[in-house]
């Protein structure tokens, strides 16, 4: 198996991959395949109502860059007073043997899951985007008796939540074959959009590819700028009673979703004052509508708030509320 | 003058279906928002369902998911409401309002009256 | 769903005095911008409700100025200053804060 796998995007439209070879590998490593997949904004994120009040907005950030590798290892160092100075403790001879033994089983457990668990691959061709070649099916774990799967940074056997796209195992998706490296970048992704990482160390070409269990990563791309714009004009329409209809786009592309717009209007002379509307409440009449306004001049301007944060706000709206009798000030949603 | 006028209502066996109606008038109908609630006899009122201006989105209450359609014509100021396996507790005078969510419902039909009877 | 309840379940009122109605929500009704969408209707025997009033205290259009809301948080009531023969109907509170809407039970409003 592939060691330490770690990802991380550089831009709105890339990831970076990087891993060690394996530790002990069954005859030489002769490439690795690197399997992606997009995966889905929980279901949850568009039903919740994230103008309520005391409903924090969903943190969803992207993968940060790497450090550099003193960096890394000075992080990963496991002990370490205020100072940084300290380095591990040396090992003893119990640890030595631990780890030697760990090794082994290692070694013995993964040649188990290529033996038993897995098929081989007949063929492979190509280092296109799309995976020509069938996947490898894996057998019903009921011929194998009870197994129990203890591997740490391993998912052999991944429970799909409700957050990834189900890929059903002879569907095709997006892979690389890398050879005489231990690190990728994977180009032409979405912006601001999580996704599933597989990678396997193969150690024959052909006529039969023979891979390791996968290790798995993810990942989330940078946000776009100007993603969360909203474009095109904010239109208006003045109803009885002065009920005013405000109307704008969804932006195209946002980064992940837009989960609520913010409305700031004021009238020309009074404070700013402020409406905030869901995803739900906007798909219901494409914005939203403003009640009882007392007579004068308004200015409106709207912002989308996506996973990633805020949008610009629009450029202000203008329009004219006409005298009307038994007017509150109000606002209507 | 804004006007809503439910029809369709019925009386019907466990199981069937019926579909009700709602012709708008006196106002902009692909404007707003509709909505559907019930009052069963001598109850309080319950939110059915709501359909979006342009009848791209469509909300439940969970005791109908699956088995009521809202939907709705903007050519014919027309909403609709389509009920399937149609049960005893489904017995209720049935409303189409205009929508004003955060206001509740600014506009209502006078209601048109489902029996589910064997 | 946010429950709304209302008390009294019934209230007999003499012509000419004045009325009051309570309605309680499970969750407070604050919005995130800062608006509270309580909401109260009525419904004359034979007919279909009537919003009155919206977001707490602003009366519809059309709406007689003896009829008046109050409340903040979870407790909210709607006043009738002297009740008249029209208004003797059933009186529902409704929240629209938090999705989807929700009714108080009704309180009955009778002439004495």
């Known amino acids: 198996v592939p060691l330490d796998p770690i990802s991380v995007s550089n831009s709105s439209s890339q990831i970076i991959l990087k891993w060690k070879p394996p530790s002990d590998p069954n005859g030489n490593i002769t490439h690795y395949l690197v399997f992606w997949e997009r995966q889905a904004e929980d279901s949850e994120l568009f039903e919740l109502d994230y103008c309520l009040k005391g409903l924090k907005l969903p943190s969803r950030t992207w993968s940060p860059p790497f450090e550099s590798e003193d960096s890394q290892k000075h992080n990963q160092s496991e002990y370490e007073d205020s100072a940084g100075e300290c380095c591990s403790c040396p090992k003893t001879d119990s640890q030595i043997l631990k780890e030697l033994e760990e090794s082994s089983f290692r070694k013995t457990f993964e040649d188990y899951l290529h033996n038993v668990v897995f098929v081989p691959r007949k063929t492979s061709s190509g280092t296109g985007a799309e995976d020509p070649r069938p996947s490898r099916k894996r057998r019903s774990l009921g011929d194998v008796g009870n197994v129990t799967v203890a591997v740490p940074t391993v998912a052999a056997f991944p429970n799909t939540s409700s957050t990834s796209v189900p890929t059903s195992p002879e569907e095709h998706r997006p892979f690389e074959k890398v050879v005489n490296k231990e690190s990728l970048v994977i180009s032409g992704l979405r912006h601001f959009t999580g996704y599933r990482i597989e990678l396997q160390a193969c150690n024959q070409d052909t006529p039969e590819e023979r891979c390791s269990v996968a290790a798995y990563v993810s990942a989330r791309t940078m946000p776009e700028a100007k993603a969360d714009d909203i474009v095109g004009p904010v239109t208006h329409e003045i109803f009885e009673n002065n009920v005013v209809h405000l109307m704008w786009q969804e932006p195209k592309e946002p980064n992940g979703l837009i989960v609520l717009y913010e409305v700031s209007y004021r009238r020309y002379g009074d404070e700013e004052l402020h409406l905030c509307v869901s995803r739900k409440h906007f798909a219901l009449e494409r914005g939203c509508r403003l009640r009882g306004l007392s007579p004068g001049n308004y200015s409106v301007r709207i912002r989308a708030t996506s996973l990633a944060g805020n949008g610009s706000w629009t450029e202000p709206t203008y329009f004219y509320v006409t005298d009307y009798l038994d007017v509150p000030s109000n606002i209507a949603k | 003058e804004v006007q809503l006028v439910e029809t369709g209502g019925g009386v019907v066996q466990p199981g069937r279906s019926l579909r009700l109606s709602c012709a708008a008038s006196g106002f902009t109908f692909s404007s707003y928002a509709m909505h559907w609630v019930r009052q069963a006899p001598g109850k309080g009122l319950e939110w059915v369902a709501v359909?979006?201006?342009?009848?791209?989105?469509?909300y439940y209450a969970d005791s109908v998911k699956g088995r009521f359609t809202i939907s709705r014509d903007n050519s014919k100021n027309t909403l609709y409401l389509q009920m399937n396996s149609l049960r005893a507790e489904d017995t209720a005078v049935y409303y189409c309002a205009r929508h004003e969510w955060g206001f509740g419902f600014d506009y209502w039909g006078q209601g048109t009256t489902v029996t589910v009877s064997s | 769903d946010v429950v709304m309840t209302q008390s009294p379940l019934s209230l007999p009122v003499t012509l000419g005095q004045p009325a009051s109605i309570s309605c309680r929500s499970s969750?407070?009704?604050?919005?995130?911008?800062?608006?509270?969408?309580l909401n109260w209707f009525q419904q004359r025997p034979g007919q279909s409700p009537r919003r009155l009033i919206y977001?707490?205290?602003n009366r519809d259009s059309g709406v007689p100025d003896r009829f008046s809301g109050s409340g903040s948080g979870t407790e909210f009531t709607l006043k009738i200053s002297r009740v008249e023969a029209e208004d003797v109907g059933v009186y529902f509170c409704m929240q629209g804060t938090y999705w989807p809407g929700t009714f108080g039970g009704g309180t009955k409003l009778e002439i004495k």
């Open positions: 977001k707490v205290s």
């Open positions: 969750q407070s009704l604050v919005y995130g911008d800062g608006n509270t969408y």
């Open positions: 359909i979006s201006y342009s009848g791209s989105n469509k």
